[in-house]
């Protein structure tokens, strides 16, 4: 149930956790029980869910998503303050691509955090998450320029380039996600 | 021939805990998606909770997150649902159906249900 | 209240053809999720009926069919019989909702006579 993030420590960035231990991996330890927890995974740099056996396990273990925000996300609680205030990119905007459970093939837009552009993606009909988007407008609109105008200009020439995957299949995914909504 | 038996249902007071199993057979358990699907007495259907083949991604209905745990147990062919913190309108019918079988996105095939009655 | 809504109860004659309705929203069926229709027999667990908007299961009489426009669905059932006295259900998924399953609140159909 542990959950994985080997990537190299490079693509960390500048992004520097407030304490040591939100770096550690997230450990659902040797036993047996199923408690829902959050840990914050370095190289999404957000607090994720995670199933902790109930014994032992690290340090980078909440009882709560707030909780975590605020003890390992540098400057959590100003940008709270902020977003409450403005136009500001929903929750859900930062959510990992989820093609949900089942074997359809939709074509949807999200929001990539690592590019800051709605990207297409191929969801399979079923659950997954809100950063799933019918139409590249409404993705644009909601987390690309959340409250901002009406966009264009080269950005929009180089996004009409890249979804031109999807007339040979979808792309591969290089991660490997582990959800637990 | 496919088959699911849920059982685990019971009467628990509010507030209490109870554990509901499906027992899988006649096909590839760990190949498929699983749900769980409740029904209150005399009223229509609710999804509750999903979970991948594998159980690496699980999802829950608003009504019931943080409060129930869908698992899997693919070496026993079993399917879970740990129910915390339970409530009246929790009182209902508990399906287990497997999920996208041949029908991509339906709920193909169901047991036949165990009653679970959360009462004082 | 459901997500989707189906009228209460619908009934027929033997012999003749019922049609139960399922509305939803742009964010549902109008949002491109299949529909799919379950048939519940009294006492008994639900069945798959209608999948993919029109698709029958191996078992299923050709006299179900289902159908999807825009943001509503229909299941059709022509030559009633008694044995067909059921709740119906439709079921899609919900963006709004990250893409969770919703029912219809069910629909009763009785055969008359």
């Known amino acids: 149930l542990s959950e994985e993030a080997d990537d190299t420590d490079s693509e960390l960035g500048s992004m520097k956790p407030l304490h040591t231990f939100c770096a550690m991996k997230a450990d659902d330890g040797p036993c047996k029980a199923m408690i829902r927890s959050y840990f914050f995974n370095m190289y999404t740099h957000q607090c994720e869910e995670f199933i902790y056996g109930g014994c032992e396990g690290n340090e980078n273990r909440f009882d709560t998503l707030e909780e975590c925000k605020k003890t390992c996300i540098p400057g959590y609680e100003k940008t709270a303050v902020k977003a409450a205030s403005g136009a500001e990119r929903p929750d859900f905007c930062f959510l990992e691509e989820d093609p949900g459970l089942c074997r359809g093939y939709m074509k949807r837009y999200l929001y990539n955090n690592q590019t800051k552009q709605c990207e297409r993606f191929v969801y399979g009909g079923c659950l997954g998450n809100r950063n799933n988007f019918e139409t590249l407008d409404e993705c644009k609109k909601i987390c690309e320029n959340p409250g901002g105008g009406s966009g264009g200009g080269l950005n929009d020439i180089f996004e009409a380039q890249k979804i031109e995957w999807h007339e040979g299949g979808p792309p591969h995914h290089h991660h490997h996600h582990h959800h637990h909504h | 021939q496919v088959q699911l038996v849920e059982s685990g249902g019971g009467l628990v007071q509010p507030g209490g805990s109870l554990r509901l199993s499906c027992a899988a057979s006649?096909?590839?358990?760990?190949?498929?998606?699983m749900s769980w699907v409740r029904q209150a007495p005399g009223k229509g259907l609710e999804w509750v909770s999903a979970?991948?083949?594998?159980?690496?991604?699980?999802y829950y209905a608003d009504s019931v997150k943080g409060r129930f745990t869908i698992s899997r147990d693919n070496s026993k062919n079993t399917l879970y649902l740990q129910m915390n913190s339970l409530r009246a309108e929790d009182t209902a019918v508990y399906y287990c159906a497997i999920l996208g079988a041949t029908s991509l996105s339906a709920f193909d095939i169901w047991g036949q249900g165990t009653m679970v009655t959360v009462s004082s | 209240q459901s997500v989707l809504t189906q009228p209460p109860s619908v009934s027929g004659a033997p012999g003749q053809r019922v049609t139960i309705s399922c509305t939803g929203s742009?964010?549902?069926?109008?949002?491109?999720?299949?529909v799919h229709w379950y048939q519940q027999l009294p006492g008994t667990a639900p069945k798959l009926l209608i999948y993919g908007n029109s698709n029958r299961p191996s078992g299923v009489p050709d006299r179900f069919s289902g159908s999807k426009s825009g943001t509503s669905a229909s299941l059709a059932i022509t030559g009633l019989q008694a044995e067909d006295e059921a709740d119906y259900y439709c079921?899609?998924?919900?963006?709004?909702?990250?893409?969770?399953?919703?029912f219809g609140g069910g629909t009763k159909l009785t055969v008359l006579g």
């Open positions: 079921q899609s998924y919900d963006s709004s909702l990250s893409g969770s399953g919703v």
């Open positions: 742009s964010s549902n069926i109008g949002a491109g999720y299949d």
């Open positions: 979970i991948s083949g594998s159980g690496g991604s699980t």
């Open positions: 006649g096909f590839t358990f760990s190949s498929y998606a």
